[in-house]
């Protein structure tokens, strides 16, 4: 889970081992800081829970893609 208590950078030390339904998701952010042990994606759920996920997993990439597509404002 995210840990930012003693550091200015939020890092992930463990990844969720279950796929999260996209229905649960509100947003995500990528963790790429060299101060963190591994690259990660932190999903924020619609009830404001933060969940660390492995960006190498296909479901994580698909979920980010889904959020990206629906977040874009349609051009008029």
């Amino acid at each position: 889970q995210p840990d930012a208590i003693n550091a200015p950078v939020t890092c992930c030390y463990n990844f969720t081992n279950r796929k999260i339904s996209v229905q649960r998701l509100a947003s995500y952010r990528r963790i790429t800081s060299s101060k963190c042990p591994k690259e990660a994606v932190i999903f924020k759920t619609i009830v404001a829970k933060e969940i660390c996920a492995d960006p190498k997993q296909k479901w994580v990439q698909d979920s980010m893609d889904h959020l990206d597509k629906q977040t874009q404002t349609p051009k008029t």
């Epitope: 339904s21 509100a26 952010r29 619609i46």
Partner: antibody, heavy 119, light 112 residues
């Protein structure tokens, strides 16, 4: 299509408990959180809390902590809310609802039960 | 808790005319992720609530495009471009940015 079917009206005594059910159909209940909302007669809406049916995680509004207990049974696609220590202030319609900002090709969705009246 | 204040509380409107409802929050609803979790609900007489708008301005499926939402920070507006008879009911704003989720006190729309 998605439906949330709540149990029937309840007439209860002060100090007693009541357990309301919300049966989901048309989607996998484990895929999303189930929320509960209170509406007193002629009044507005109050959020009670949510349950994650997949693992039983819950979160309650401070006002309802200790009075409301949310549970779910994925095998029967049913969510439950138990209210204890009932008083006249708890006479209300209680709604279950599930919603998302994303999740379909169109975008978000929101579904509500028909409400259970507790008197 | 975040207080959501709606105005007016009662809104008599002539059929075919526009209507506007204001919702002000006691704190900004802009979340740390850059999104604003402000929604609008409609509750017709004797019915369950129904979400009309989410994330300030996105219309739910099946909601007529005469409804629109706008705003940012602490000030939000629901507009109906031309009121129809089926629009009668109570409208609530609802925030999901801060715990616990809270609702406005409701605006009752009626036909003049």
């Amino acid at each position: 299509q998605v439906q949330l079917l709540e149990s029937g009206a309840e007439l209860v005594r002060p100090g007693s408990s009541v357990k309301i059910s919300c049966k989901a159909s048309g989607y996998a209940i484990k895929d999303n959180y189930m929320h509960w909302v209170k509406q007193r007669p002629g009044q507005g809406l109050e959020w009670i809390g949510w349950i994650d049916p997949e693992n039983g995680d819950t979160e309650y509004a401070p006002k309802f902590q200790g009075q409301a207990t949310l549970t779910a049974d994925t095998s029967s696609s049913t969510a439950y809310m138990q209210l204890s220590g009932l008083t006249s202030e708890d006479s209300a319609v209680y709604y279950c609802n599930t919603w998302a900002y994303y999740g379909t090709s169109y975008g978000g969705f929101a579904y509500w039960g028909q409400g259970t009246t507790v008197t | 808790d975040i207080v959501m204040t709606q105005s007016p509380l009662s809104l008599p409107v002539t059929l075919g005319q526009p209507a506007s409802i204001s919702c002000k929050s006691s704190q900004s609803l802009l979340d740390s992720d850059g999104k604003t979790y402000l929604n609008w609900l409609q509750q017709r007489p004797g019915q369950s609530p129904r979400r009309l708008i989410y994330l300030v301005s996105k219309l739910d499926s099946g909601v007529p495009d005469r409804f629109s939402g706008s705003g940012s920070g602490t000030d939000f507006t629901l507009k109906i471009s031309r009121v129809e008879a089926e629009d009668v009911g109570v409208y609530y704003c609802w925030q999901g940015t801060h715990f616990p989720q809270t609702f406005g006190q409701g605006t009752k729309l009626e036909i003049k």
